[in-house]
Interface confidence: low
């Protein structure tokens, strides 16, 4: 469907509000260090230009591609060279190389201050004084910190953000109303960002075949009553949407996502009985709801898979004729029967099946060769089942904080070269799997846990790619997307690691510890724990527990003291000396 003016087409399809929001997100994700006012100026200029093209599609420059228009606009920023260094070199390139260059300079860990939440009254005043600027600021601040955030979904978060302020700034107790809502949005937003980052990594590092395989498995679990052709159509459209968003084509992505939601709602009967309540909602809410919709019930009369995929004499003929389609159908059939399996496990099974067919279809007696293929799946299935069982037992025994600490020790021993802040962030998030998944019924534990771990480990991979320090991490991250988690699980203590020299400064604490929130205190203690393990990688659990218990007691004692700083100055060196002795 070709249009004389792409920018006019998208403006008309999306409407001014969404158009401006998406352009602001796009610019903020590319130029993450630019001040808010600069971005607003650029967005207003692009919007005015788009309006001239809507009025006359033949007007000058209206026929240019969106990449050309947006890239030209970004390259007008005066401080590009000073602020971004070599990213400014992108502007010397032609499209499509220029956009690729901007994409490569997206920073997953930008050097930006953490967002501080002002007092509720201050926020409510700002909201009432200029609602539009307040909401743009939200889009800008989230987008620049999360350069791969799923843009149409960020518009949905902004709508919820607006609704929270509209409701709570009128309430008798503004804080009691607003703060839980903001906490929820923050936590959901971080989770959404991390999930989308995995989708983009899957597309960018492993290609659209990998993403399509993931989508076939997930959508077949969600829509087990849908036929394969229907699932295929949804997968193709979903792949297009995410390819666009991950590639910075946010207007096309949002437009195509809206079309996909429309298609799904018009074809509910052939997709899922669970879509109805989503389809009554407005666009942003509808798309979100469809993405999160629960699995439909499995058809009651599904036959055994063995007939078509093991017992049939035509397996090799069917496989040879259209390999991807045959494997896609296998994955579809397996996934719709197994909502209790993680997507990653299903993909491992499909990979194992493919490897067996590649080997057996070249053998003298193919049928004899692949007859036991389903038996080979058993260890692949049992590995994540056992992992989830063991870790949930540990979580229930220790509670979240101590479970995180156990994972911190485990992962620091596996990959001690990784930076301490990264190990703390990743291990804390790995530890959240307990509260998120272990309370679920057995049939939902594995998909919850393993697919969540895949998202968290992708964050480790993304951060490590920026500053590679460990060959083991590189190997686990790059060899196979579906085997990342088993690869990390299988890592042992790094025997080649030279322990970090002891640095007393790392273990010196001050009275400011006492004013920290509970979460910040935990992070401080966990940072110290990682440093301890880096110093003594072979320390036993008991030794580390003893040091951490002493640490907690020392901090508690000094925070109760009249002269807190004096207590830290006096007790700190004693704690350090005792810790060194305990770990000797």
């Amino acid at each position: 469907d070709t249009h004389k003016s792409e920018v006019a087409h998208r403006f008309k399809d999306l409407g001014e509000e969404h158009f401006k929001g998406l352009v602001l997100v796009a610019f903020s994700q590319y130029l993450q260090q630019c001040p808010f006012e600069e971005h607003v100026k650029l967005v207003n200029e692009v919007t005015e230009f788009a309006k001239t093209c809507v009025a006359d599609e033949s007007a000058e420059n209206c026929d240019k591609s969106l990449h050309t228009l947006f890239g030209d606009k970004l390259c007008t920023v005066a401080t590009l060279r000073e602020t971004y260094g070599e990213m400014a070199d992108c502007c010397a390139k032609q499209e499509p190389e220029r956009n690729e260059c901007f994409l490569q300079h997206k920073d997953d860990n930008p050097n930006l201050p953490p967002l501080v939440r002002p007092e509720v009254d201050v926020m409510c005043t700002a909201f009432h004084d200029n609602e539009a600027t307040f909401l743009k600021k939200y889009l800008y601040e989230v987008a620049r910190r999360h350069p791969y955030f799923y843009a149409p979904e960020l518009l949905f978060f902004a709508a919820r953000y607006k609704a929270a302020f509209a409701e709570c700034c009128q309430a008798a107790d503004k804080a009691a109303c607003l703060l839980p809502k903001l906490d929820e949005l923050r936590d959901e937003g971080k989770a959404s960002s991390a999930k989308q980052r995995l989708k983009c990594a899957s597309l960018q590092k492993f290609g659209d075949r990998a993403f399509k395989a993931w989508a076939v498995a997930r959508l077949s679990q969600k829509f087990p009553k849908a036929e394969f052709a229907e699932v295929s159509k949804l997968v193709t459209d979903l792949t297009k949407v995410h390819t666009e968003c991950c590639h910075g084509d946010l207007l096309e992505c949002a437009d195509d996502r809206a079309d996909l939601a429309k298609y799904m709602c018009e074809n509910q009967d052939s997709i899922s009985s669970k879509l109805k309540e989503c389809c009554d909602k407005p666009l942003l809410e509808k798309s979100h709801c469809l993405a999160e919709v629960e699995n439909d019930e499995m058809p009651a009369d599904l036959p055994s898979l063995a007939a078509d995929y093991v017992e049939s004499k035509d397996v090799c003929k069917n496989y040879a004729e259209a390999k991807d389609v045959f494997l896609g159908m296998f994955l579809y059939e397996y996934a719709r029967r197994h909502p209790d399996y993680s997507v990653m496990l299903l993909l491992r099974l499909a990979k194992a099946y493919e490897a067996t067919l590649e080997k057996c279809c070249a053998a003298a007696d193919p049928h004899e060769c692949y007859a036991k293929v389903f038996d080979e799946f058993q260890p692949l299935v049992e590995e994540p089942q056992n992992l989830v069982k063991q870790n949930c037992e540990l979580f229930e025994q220790l509670g979240e904080y101590k479970f995180q600490n156990a994972l911190l020790v485990r992962y620091t021993k596996k990959v001690p070269q990784v930076s301490t802040p990264t190990l703390v962030e990743v291990s804390r998030n790995l530890g959240k799997v307990g509260a998120k998944c272990c309370k679920l019924p057995e049939a939902k534990r594995m998909p919850c846990a393993e697919d969540y771990l895949s998202v968290v480990l992708n964050r480790l991979c993304v951060l490590h790619e920026k500053t590679p320090v460990s060959e083991k991490v590189t190997k686990c991250c790059t060899e196979s997307l579906v085997n990342r988690r088993p690869c990390f699980s299988a890592l042992e203590l790094d025997e080649a690691y030279v322990p970090k020299a002891f640095n007393a400064e790392t273990f010196t604490f001050h009275a400011d510890m006492c004013t920290l929130s509970e979460k910040e205190k935990q992070v401080k203690k966990q940072t110290a724990l990682v440093e301890l393990v880096k110093h003594k990688p072979k320390a036993t659990k008991e030794q580390l527990k003893g040091v951490m218990d002493n640490f907690a007691a020392f901090v508690e004692k000094c925070c109760k003291a009249d002269d807190k700083e004096a207590c830290f100055a006096e007790e700190g060196p004693k704690f350090v000396a005792a810790s060194q002795a305990a770990l000797a």
Partner: nanobody, 124 residues
Framework: EVQLVESGGGVVQPGDSLRLSCAAS????????MGWFRQAPGKEREFVSA????????YYANSVKGRFTISRDNSKNTVYLQLNSLRPEDTALYYC?????????????????WGQGTLVTVSS
């Protein structure tokens, strides 16, 4: 470069049948997935049916399932679409398409070559 030429369209009454043909030239026909798409006046092009290289896999849109049948004859480099129990809403320009590397048969942008279309009008 594959050339595709559709034929067999026409004006029929509701409930009637038609058989569309699509003759291919310029490529190794048996290596292509073949598909039929249609576009009604003022509407977007939509998937109708597709068939794999050796006719093992066939796909149909829900709206035509049970009424339309796709087939191919690799020796004649031709793909067919049998249209039965035609309805007024089947009125459209029917396009034949060929794809060398498609994984998923239902998306028009995965097809590399297209015919000019043959018009089917169902009217009483």
């Amino acid at each position: 470069e594959v050339q595709l030429v559709e034929s067999g369209g026409g004006v029929v009454q509701p409930g009637d049948s038609l058989r569309l043909s699509c003759a291919a030239s310029g490529g190794t026909f048996s290596t292509y997935v073949m598909g039929w798409f249609r576009q009604a006046p003022g509407k977007e092009r939509e998937f109708v049916s597709a068939i794999s290289q050796n006719s093992i896999h066939t796909y149909y849109a829900n709206s035509v399932k049970g009424r339309f049948t796709i087939s191919r004859d690799n020796s004649k480099n031709t793909v067919y679409l049998q249209l039965n129990s035609l309805r007024p809403e089947d009125t459209a320009l029917y396009y034949c398409a060929a794809s060398r590397f498609t994984s998923w048969y239902t998306a028009d942008y995965e097809y590399d070559y297209w015919g000019q279309g043959t018009l089917v009008t169902v009217s009483s």
